[in-house]
Interface confidence: medium
């Protein structure tokens, strides 16, 4: 599923991401835009043999199990394929664990490079939330 901007903002808000660990909803929508272009089925492979999955591009080295990443920790205790569902519950629950891990949203490279320090509220402007 490819979400619309406001559609995703509403879904993320329903799942309790607005101001989760101090990060406003705009941060999460911005991260999703630049991680996956709002596509729940996005997958991207990394040079270390891991793969990033889903709308927030969650990595198989640490957070989920795809059955083929050497030394996978699977800290979210889920199959990576669950992160590709049109239902973003699994991605959101895992993202909450990631953002609580100490580095906050810096865990997402795209957020660090494209969203951090910008007017992230623009990503939810005009949305009925």
């Amino acid at each position: 599923k490819v979400f619309g901007r406001c559609e995703l903002a509403a879904a993320m808000k329903r799942h309790g991401l607005d101001n989760y660990r101090g990060y406003s909803l705009g941060n999460w929508v911005c991260a999703a835009k630049f991680e996956s272009n709002f596509n729940t089925q996005a997958t991207n492979r990394n040079t270390d043999g891991s793969t990033d999955y889903g709308i927030l591009q969650i990595n198989s080295r640490w957070w989920c199990n795809d059955g083929r990443t050497p030394g996978s920790r699977n800290l979210c205790n889920i199959p990576c394929s669950a992160l590709l569902s049109s239902d973003i519950t699994a991605s959101v629950n895992c993202a909450k664990k990631i953002v609580s891990d100490g580095n906050g949203m810096n865990a997402w490279v795209a957020w660090r490079n494209r969203c951090k320090g910008t007017d992230v509220q623009a990503w939810i402007r005009g949305c009925r939330l």
């Epitope: 997958t43 043999g49 795809d66 059955g67 050497p70 199959p79 590709l84």
Partner: antibody
């Protein structure tokens, strides 16, 4: 136990297309990547690419882009590989395997012969 | 692409001999190297994963070692059922690649 059952041998004419199937049992099909491997005598084993059935995400070896197309049907736990514009170079045994990084589980192989 | 070079191409041995098969990678692949045995008209069979971890049900005479670019599959006291082709495969990066194989044959 995990099993991958491939479709039977095919004899095709040059220029035609063929679709090979790989039915998986014994595990959660949508969760694991299915990989496709080509074997020709004297050419060893070549990785064609992979599909994640749960999402339809695919990756192809550059060498096989335009030649192979992967699909999967999660309702029947079956992955498919279509090979198009067949030539004699496509005559080979084609294997599906469960993608664990390594390949512990393989299909029995589908022999494709391309001949006029 | 990472190239895997296996040597020797053919190895002629007598049952009871111990042998070593080599697989060399064109660049470092850490321990992401796996070994397979294949007999005629059969699918490959996983022997060793991650350079040194024995796959389930594999006899203890098979062992693997190495890291980086140089890897070895050792067979301690070859048995007649061990004859066939042996391939290495890397999962360090895409595309996945295989070595050209070593044929283990009876002398």
């Amino acid at each position: 136990q995990v099993q991958l059952q491939e479709s039977g041998a095919e004899v095709m004419k040059p220029g035609a297309s063929v679709k090979i199937s790989c039915k998986a049992t014994g595990y959660t099909f949508s969760t694991y990547w299915i990989e496709w491997v080509k074997q020709r005598p004297g050419h060893g084993l070549e990785w064609i690419g992979e599909i994640l059935p749960g999402s339809g995400s695919t990756y192809y070896n550059e060498k096989f882009k335009g030649k192979a197309t992967f699909t999967a049907d999660t309702s029947s736990n079956t992955a498919y590989m279509q090979l198009s514009s067949l030539t004699s170079e496509d005559s080979a045994v084609y294997y599906c395997a469960r993608g664990d990084g390594w390949y512990c589980y393989w299909g029995q192989g589908t022999t494709l012969t391309v001949s006029s | 692409d990472i190239e895997l070079t296996q040597s020797p191409a053919t190895l002629s041995v007598t049952p009871g001999d111990s042998v070593s098969l080599s697989c060399r990678a064109s660049q470092s692949i850490s321990n992401n190297l796996h070994w397979y045995q294949q007999k005629p008209h059969e699918s490959p069979r996983l022997l060793i994963k991650y350079a040194s971890q024995s796959a389930s049900g594999i006899p203890s005479r098979f062992s693997g070692s190495g890291s980086g670019t140089d890897f070895t599959l050792s067979i301690n006291s070859v048995e007649t059922e061990d004859f066939g082709m042996y391939f290495c495969q890397q999962s360090n990066s895409w595309p996945r690649t295989f070595g050209g194989g070593t044929k283990l044959e009876i002398k």
